[in-house]
Amino acid sequence: NIDVCKLGTVTVQPAPVIPLGSAANISCSLNPKQGCSHYPSSNELILLKFVNDVLVENLHGKKVHDHTGHSSTFQVTNLSLGMTLFVCKLNCSNSQKKPPVPVCGVEISVGVAPEPPQNISCVQEGENGTVACSWNSGKVTYLKTNYTLQLSGPNNLTCQKQCFSDNRQNCNRLDLGINLSPDLAESRFIVRVTAINDLGNSSSLPHTFTFLDIVIPLPPWDIRINFLNASGSRGTLQWEDEGQVVLNQLRYQPLNSTSWNMVNATNAKGKYDLRDLRPFTEYEFQISSKLHLSGGSWSNWSESLRTRTPEEEPVGILDIWYMKQDIDYDRQQISLFWKSLNPSEARGKILHYQVTLQEVTKKTTLQNTTRHTSWTRVIPRTGAWTASVSAANSKGASAPTHINIVDLCGTGLLAPHQVSAKSENMDNILVTWQPPKKADSAVREYIVEWRALQPGSITKFPPHWLRIPPDNMSALISENIKPYICYEIRVHALSESQGGCSSIRGDSKHKAPVSGPHITAITEKKERLFISWTHIPFPEQRGCILHYRIYWKERDSTAQPELCEIQYRRSQNSHPISSLQPRVTYVLWMTAVTAAGESPQGNEREFCPQGKAN
């Protein structure tokens, strides 16, 4: 509520706005009859410098002129860009207890003259839009700077708008509020931007343009697609555009894709036929427009149209495999398995599969539809059987895939040789083989099939298989391969009407088993001891067991035990040993060995042979 300048005045020379690097003189003068009441000679004027309302300096030592008790002049230098506040105060030196009294203050602004505006760019959005121009102002002036945008054109057309920049707002764009119409398409227009502040002024170079240079069409709207005869691959894309548009760019892609299909369409008039779409696929479509074939700018992309193409009948062939087992004296169970079509082959939602089993000579046919990817039937063991499967969606069915039902491992001469299985990493196994040595018919293909060596349901846990061309002798199997599980792998060689196979076990990663086999019984027969055991539970095997070891030593002996190593066969659960002395008590135990090492020992059993050993 105090009038700060009641006691005196503050003036600045040469001006309150100065260029960067300049000095200024600030004079502080007391009004008549103002000052320290009793002793005018004790009047002391001080000048304080504030930046952002913070006192940064007392300019006591910068006095250049002093009329004692009346006025003082201070020189200020090295002022930083922007605004600095100076406050003059009166200090009555005889009264130490009273704080200095404000006399008056002044703001000095330090800045630079504006640079000529550059890179002027003008646009008019749509045929009915208005012209707006933007520019680069150059270096910040730190002063209030006025900008004037002037447009001139044919028929004495002139127009101008103004705006200013300061420390709160930036002016580098102005909308002139006028519309250029297409009938001025060939006319030339000139714009210039002038910048003025307290330290100077500058003008841009004139910027010349035509209607076509600056008008950006509005993006197309109301996009839709019509599929001809509900086709999944052909559709007509339609949209609305501004009247003057002569060129469109279309882009479209499946939603999970990373690259667009691009199409240029001239004089499309809001319609374009697409012929290479993928059926039953989610697509995204966008369109952009241009007013002139060679000049002008493209509009922004339209909003996306997202839609799914209709279904078409499936294409491609199903990958079929089978398993057959004799289930009584004159019947066999055929379990057919097939892999789902990939989306580009299914071309729609697969509703069911049509399965046919046919006995070729007697013309017996079993037919069924199923929604599963397997089908099981009991048929006579006699006759030559063939199976076919096709996939159906709402538009139709794929061509049936045929397979001859042969005895897959029936022909020894067709058995592949030197089958090996090597772990490649945690989740795959490399299987290699050599072709059959004396095949009496040509190998049409190899099938590599694998199953976990764990109890499983025949239908719930279908086989995994790979089809391999006849000139390939290796396969990398990875589907459903888990570490620490042993797989039985079969390589089938198939001719037109026969099959031969070879088996091997393999794992992708192994550890030593958790435990050894459990000895269940020791029996003596014909001067030999038979050791019987139960196998290690599957989860504890931790890979393929290569062999078992039976250890024995005399009870209480500190000698190393003897051992017998036997090849692992799941079907074997007993083994004879014949090097034990009669009427000597022995301790026996077993271990299991994988490629990673030996298990801890299983249970110990004591036994004292009675008969004559050896």
Partner: nanobody, 119 residues
Framework: QVQLQESGGGLVQAGGSLRLSCAAS????????MYWYRQAPGKQREFVAY???????NYLDSVNGRFTISRDNAKNSVYLQMNSLKPEDTAVYYC?????????????WGQGTQVTVSS
């Protein structure tokens, strides 16, 4: 190991019905494919019906339409409903479970239950 126990057999007149039951116990976590077989005196054992994990069923031609196989997973049981019985259906009926380990098929059998159809 898997244990199977059949029940429900007996003497019935031609045209009558019986319902056989088979209860499974033991290591049955991987048993999904269940079968009924029968063996008539002086003949070989023959397949009658099976039911898969996905409840797909298949029958011997001569019993198709008269016999129905079903299962109750909660009770670990499989059933054979036999209607319009004929004297030639007389046999010991066996429950069978198959599971696969690698490519080897392990089979488990029950003790059998006698079905006699009188004319």
């Amino acid at each position: 190991q898997v244990q199977l126990q059949e029940s429900g057999g007996g003497l019935v007149q031609a045209g009558g019905s019986l319902r056989l039951s088979c209860a499974a116990s033991g290591s049955i976590f991987a048993i999904d494919d269940m079968y009924w077989y029968r063996q008539a005196p002086g003949k070989q054992r023959e397949f009658v019906a099976y039911i898969t994990a996905t409840n797909s069923a298949n029958y011997l031609d001569s019993v198709n339409g008269r016999f129905t196989i079903s299962r109750d997973n909660a009770k670990n049981s499989v059933y054979l409903q036999m209607n319009s019985l004929k004297p030639e259906d007389t046999a010991v009926y066996y429950c069978n479970a198959k599971q696969i380990v690698g490519f080897q098929i392990d089979e488990y059998w029950g003790q059998g239950t006698q079905v006699t159809v009188s004319s």
